[in-house]
């Protein structure tokens, strides 16, 4: 559910939201670390309804959710890290 992507392209998010999204509506969370053309960390939430939302990394709910997911994944498998170029 938690993915970290390293890209060599500019920022993906134009607008960010802080609105809480219940976990049961979320398919996966994509994290784009800052650097490589984008000065900020970006978080993209892919919802089960096939829509996509850019979430403000400072939003309390997403920080807490990532903390929970990291704890869960560290007790089972490490957080998957994918290197990929986005066209």
């Amino acid at each position: 559910v938690l993915e970290v992507y390293y890209t060599s392209l500019r920022c993906r998010c134009v607008q960010e939201s802080s609105v809480f999204i219940p976990r049961r509506f979320i398919d996966r969370i994509q994290i784009l670390p800052r650097g490589n053309g984008c000065p900020r960390k970006e978080i993209i939430v892919w919802k089960k309804n096939k829509s996509i939302v850019c979430v403000d990394p400072q939003a309390e709910w997403i920080q807490r959710m990532m903390e929970v997911l990291r704890k869960r994944s560290s007790s089972t498998l490490p957080v998957p890290v994918f290197k990929r170029k986005i066209p």
């Epitope: 809480f20 219940p22 509506f25 919802k47 089960k48 309390e60 709910w61 959710m65």
Partner: antibody, heavy 120, light 107 residues
């Protein structure tokens, strides 16, 4: 204009069954999660359960999952609540609501409510 | 289940007053809280979602705040149309739960 028109309420005997309906118009019904909520006389709102767009996920309040069944027919734009083994404490006003999962993530549209009275 | 506790069942106020309704969650619900208004003979209406966001068309005298376990709903200047029962609601996790409601009446 979004409308959720409820029907099927009425008087039912203890131990009996009843099926409530909620017909949606003005929305793409097949895209949305839907919930049932009730309000018993003199009490607050109580969530019964919810169903996702393709009926593959149905969540219930633990205390109610053995007596209520939530279903939907997207071709008819209609949500259902099948009530069975009803008791006096099931007497309430029953509401259907749209559970938005695009912008608000809360119940943003509600039906007008339908009354269920359990009595012999 | 997460219990949502609204400290007051009834609150009495006057037109023009500022009134705050509090709600406490039995465990951390982040900002997964909404506030509803229900008037007699009407269905509940969504006022606030994600703890502090005003729903479309809701007057700006209604505000919400809080996170984790403590939440507050405020009407900055009570109007004659505001008497109703106000419910807090957590949608952080299943089962979804509501507070018992706070009935706001005019003196």
């Amino acid at each position: 204009e979004v409308k959720l028109l409820q029907s099927g309420g009425g008087l039912v005997q203890p131990g009996g069954s009843l099926k409530l309906s909620c017909a949606a118009s003005g929305i793409d019904f097949s895209r949305y999660w839907m919930s049932w909520v009730r309000r018993a006389p003199g009490k607050g709102l109580e969530w019964i359960g919810e169903i996702n767009p393709d009926s593959s996920t149905i969540n219930y309040a633990p205390s109610l999952k053995d007596k209520f069944i939530i279903s939907r027919d997207n071709a008819k734009n209609t949500l259902y609540l099948q009530m069975s083994k009803v008791r006096s404490e099931d007497t309430a006003l029953y509401y259907c609501a749209r559970q938005d999962d695009y912008d608000y993530y809360a119940m943003d549209y509600w039906g007008q409510g339908t009354s269920v009275t359990v009595s012999s | 289940d997460i219990v949502m506790t609204q400290s007051h069942k009834f609150m009495s106020t006057s037109v023009g007053d500022r009134v705050s309704i509090t709600c406490k969650a039995s465990q951390d619900v982040s900002t997964g809280v909404a506030w509803y208004q229900q008037k007699p003979g009407q269905s509940p209406k969504l006022l606030i979602y994600s703890a502090s966001y005003r729903y479309t068309g809701v007057p700006d005298r209604f505000t919400g705040s809080g996170s984790r376990t403590d939440f507050t709903f405020t009407i900055s200047s009570v109007q004659t149309e505001d008497p109703a029962v106000y419910y807090c609601h957590q949608y952080y996790t299943i089962p979804l739960t509501f507070g018992a409601g706070t009935e706001l009446e005019l003196k």
